[in-house]
C-alpha cells in the first residue's frame, strides 16, 4: 500500500517507531521467515536491511530474495497455468503395522494452517499392528505330540507362559498389549479363591524368540467355570515384527466340521517332556456330538456319564468345539492349553484364532482336544480391552 509516508515513519503494519538512542540511529531491517512446514531457502541469513536507495539488501545475496520450500526437503512443485499447488501429506505405517482411519490417510493444509482430511477432519490416523499375516506360514504336515518343529516362526502369536511352579502353558497374542489364555492356566498352582491380583505377579510370559514381557494384570471371564478363558494385559505394547505378531479374531465362525486348523504349543511331547522348541500339528474340527459321546457317553443330558479315557472330564458346551486327533497320532498335550486353533482364511489370506485350546489332556490317548470358541467370547474380549 502506498501510504505516501516516508519509510522512516510508522510502518504500515502498525509497529511503533523504535526509540532513538544517543549518538546512534535506527537501521530498518526485516527477517524473512516461512510458515509452518516450510523452510527458508537462501544463501544468506534471511535478514534484509534498507539501503539509501530504499532497496532491501542482504549482506550475502544482495537484493535476491529467499524462497520458502517444503520442510521435508522436497523441491517446490512447479506451477501450472490457471492452477495452484495444494499441499497434502499421506500418512503411512511402518512394516507390520497398518493405518487405522475412517479416511484415506491423506491430509491437506487448509487456510488456518491445519492438516485436514476430507472424511475425518483434523483427527489423525493411528498405526495398528497387522494381525494374522505370518511371513512364513506353516508347512502342512501329515504327522504337538509327534508334531513338527516351527523352525520358521510360523506362529508369531504364540506365547509361552510359565507358572511360579515352573509349569509351561500357552497364551495367544491378540493385539499389541493383550493375550488370551485359559482360566485354568491362570489358576495353575493357585487355590480356587485366588484373585486376578494374586495371580498376575506369579506368571512369567515370553513372546517371539523367548522375549520376556511384563504382565500388568489378568482378567478372568465372568463365567470361567464354563468358559475357560482369561485375558492377560501387558505393561507395555510389544513391538510387532516377523517373530511377534497377533493373530486376528474372527467375525465368522470357522469351526466347521472337517476344517483343518493349526495348533502350536510348548507343551509335553511324545516323551511326555516339555518341548524345548515350539511344535505344531494340523487337526480337523470334529463332529460335536461324536466328541460329546466320546467324553460323556451320550448327548442326552440324563444319560451322560463321565467316561474320559484320560480320567479328566473336559468342559463341553455351546461355547466349545472339538478337534480330532488324526490317524497320524498327532495331538495336543499337557501345556498346550491357551494356544490358538489357527485357521487360514484363503479369501483374505489371513490367519484367525478360531478357538483357544482348553482341554489339553488328550495326548493321543483320548480322541479329541477341546477348544473355547473365540466367536463366543468376542464381545467380552472387546469390552474388557476397551474398559482396561
Amino acid at each position: 500500500v502506498d501510504s505516501g509516508n516516508d519509510v522512516t515513519d510508522i510502518a504500515d503494519d502498525g509497529c511503533p517507531k523504535p526509540p532513538e538512542i544517543a549518538h546512534g540511529y535506527v537501521e530498518h531491517s526485516v527477517r524473512y521467515q516461512c510458515k509452518n512446514y516450510y523452510k527458508l531457502r537462501t544463501e544468506g541469513d534471511g535478514v534484509y536491511t534498507l539501503n539509501d536507495k530504499k532497496q532491501w539488501i542482504n549482506k550475502a545475496v544482495g537484493d535476491k530474495l529467499p524462497e520458502c520450500e517444503a520442510d521435508d526437503g522436497c523441491p517446490k512443485p512447479p506451477e501450472i497455468a490457471h492452477g495452484y499447488v495444494e499441499h497434502s501429506v499421506r500418512y503411512q505405517c511402518k512394516n507390520y503395522y497398518k493405518l487405522r482411519t475412517e479416511g484415506d490417510g491423506v491430509y491437506t493444509l487448509n487456510n488456518e494452517k491445519q492438516w485436514i482430511n476430507k472424511a475425518v477432519g483434523d483427527k489423525l490416523p493411528e498405526c495398528e499392528a497387522v494381525c494374522g499375516k505370518p511371513k512364513n506360514p506353516a508347512n502342512p504336515v501329515q504327522r504337538i505330540l509327534g508334531g513338527h518343529l516351527d523352525a520358521k516362526g510360523s506362529f508369531p502369536w504364540q506365547a509361552k507362559m510359565v507358572s511360579h511352579h515352573n509349569l509351561t502353558t500357552g497364551a495367544t497374542l491378540i493385539n499389541e498389549q493383550w493375550l488370551l489364555t485359559t482360566a485354568k492356566n491362570l489358576f495353575l498352582n493357585h487355590s480356587e479363591n485366588a484373585t486376578a491380583k494374586d495371580i498376575a505377579p506369579t506368571l512369567t510370559l515370553y513372546v517371539g524368540k523367548k522375549q520376556l514381557v511384563e504382565i500388568e494384570k489378568v482378567v478372568l471371564h465372568p463365567n470361567y467355570s464354563q468358559v475357560d478363558i482369561g485375558l492377560i494385559k501387558l505393561k507395555q505394547k510389544v513391538s510387532v515384527n516377523e517373530r511377534v505378531m497377533p493373530i486376528c479374531l474372527p467375525s465368522k465362525d470357522y469351526a466347521e466340521v472337517g476344517r483343518v486348523g493349526y495348533v502350536s504349543g510348548w507343551g509335553r511331547n511324545a516323551n511326555f517332556k516339555f518341548t524345548d522348541h515350539l511344535k505344531y500339528v494340523m487337526l480337523p474340527v470334529a463332529d460335536q456330538d461324536q466328541c460329546i459321546r466320546h467324553y460323556e457317553g451320550s448327548t442326552v443330558p440324563e444319560k451322560k456319564t463321565p467316561k474320559s479315557p484320560v480320567g479328566v472330564q473336559p468342559i463341553l458346551n455351546e461355547h466349545t468345539f472339538c478337534a480330532g486327533m488324526s490317524k497320524y497320532q498327532e495331538d495336543t498335550c499337557y501345556g498346550d492349553a491357551g494356544s490358538a486353533f489357527a485357521v487360514h482364511d484363503l479369501e483374505e489370506d489371513t490367519w484367525y484364532a478360531t478357538g483357544i485350546l482348553s482341554f489339553d489332556k488328550s495326548c493321543a490317548v483320548a480322541e479329541y482336544g477341546v477348544y473355547v470358541k473365540v466367536t463366543s467370547i468376542q464381545d467380552w474380549v472387546q469390552k474388557t480391552i476397551a474398559e482396561n
Epitope: 506360514p137 465368522k252 466347521e256 476344517r259 485357521v343 482364511d345 484363503l346 479369501e347 483374505e348
Partner: antibody, heavy 121, light 107 residues
C-alpha cells in the same frame, strides 16, 4: 440338506447371450465363495468363474474373461452367470458349486445338477 | 497362471489292485489341492481336500499325499464302484484350475 439348483440353460446361436441362475438353500449363502464350473460333452472339468464371499471380488478363466459376468444376490441366495458373445466351444454343462468352508475358494463339497448350454446355429 | 497336469490320462487295473494317480502343479501350491471323483452321468464328488484330508463318508481305501508341486491320489484296493474319472484341483487362490482328469477302468 444343502441344495444348489441351476436354471437358464438352453440352445443359443453363436454370438447370442444367456443368463444362468443358481438358487442355494440350507446354508448361510453370503459366508461362502461360489463358483461356476463347466464340462463340455465328453471332456474334463473346467473352472469358469468365482465370486468371493466378502466384498465383491470376481475371478474368471482366461477363456471366458470379458464375455462372462458372475454376480450374486445374497438376500435371495442366488448366484448368476451372464454369458455373452457365445461361441460353439462354450457348449457345456454348467455347474454351480459351493466352497466347502468359510474363507475357502474351492474344494467344492456341493454341486448343482448342472444346466446344459448348447451353442449352435 | 499355474497349470495342473494329471497322469496317466487313463488306466486299467484289476479289482484289489493298488492304483496311484499323480497331479503336478507348475508352481508350488502348498497343500491346497482337492481330488474329485466323477462317475458317468453324475456330478463330481469331493474325495480329498488339503492334499490328504479324507472327506467325510469317503472310504478309507482312498488317500492323498504330497505338498508343494507333486501330489498323489491312491486307491489301496480298487473296487468295481471306483470306476470313474478322477480330477485334481488347486484350491489356494483363483484361477482354480482342474487337472485334465484320469479315467479309471477295471480290467
Amino acid at each position: 440338506e444343502v441344495q444348489l439348483l441351476e436354471s437358464g440353460g438352453g440352445l443359443v446361436q453363436p454370438g447370442g447371450s444367456l443368463k444362468l441362475s443358481c438358487v442355494a438353500s440350507e446354508f448361510t449363502f453370503s459366508n461362502y465363495a461360489m463358483s461356476w464350473v463347466r464340462q463340455a460333452p465328453g471332456k474334463g472339468l473346467e473352472w469358469v468363474s468365482t465370486f468371493s464371499s466378502g466384498g465383491s471380488r470376481t475371478f474368471y478363466a482366461d477363456s471366458v474373461r470379458g464375455r462372462f459376468t458372475i454376480s450374486r444376490d445374497n438376500s435371495n441366495n442366488m448366484l448368476f452367470l451372464q454369458i455373452d458373445s457365445l461361441r460353439a466351444e462354450d457348449t457345456a454343462v454348467y455347474y454351480c458349486a459351493k466352497a466347502q468352508f468359510v474363507g475357502h475358494w474351492a474344494q467344492y463339497n456341493y454341486w448343482g445338477q448342472g444346466a446344459l448350454v448348447t451353442v449352435s446355429s | 497362471d499355474i497349470q495342473m497336469t494329471q497322469s496317466p490320462s487313463s488306466l486299467s487295473a484289476s479289482v484289489g489292485d493298488r492304483v496311484a494317480i499323480t497331479c503336478r502343479a507348475s508352481q508350488g501350491i502348498r497343500n491346497y489341492l482337492a481330488w474329485y471323483q466323477q462317475k458317468p452321468g453324475k456330478v463330481p464328488k469331493l474325495l480329498i481336500y488339503d492334499a490328504f484330508i479324507l472327506q467325510s463318508g469317503v472310504p478309507s481305501r482312498f488317500s492323498g499325499s504330497g505338498s508343494g508341486t507333486d501330489f498323489t491320489l491312491t486307491i489301496s484296493s480298487l473296487q468295481p464302484e471306483d470306476v470313474a474319472t478322477y480330477y485334481c484341483q488347486k484350491s489356494d487362490s483363483p484361477p482354480l484350475t482342474f487337472g485334465g482328469g484320469t479315467k479309471v477302468e477295471i480290467k
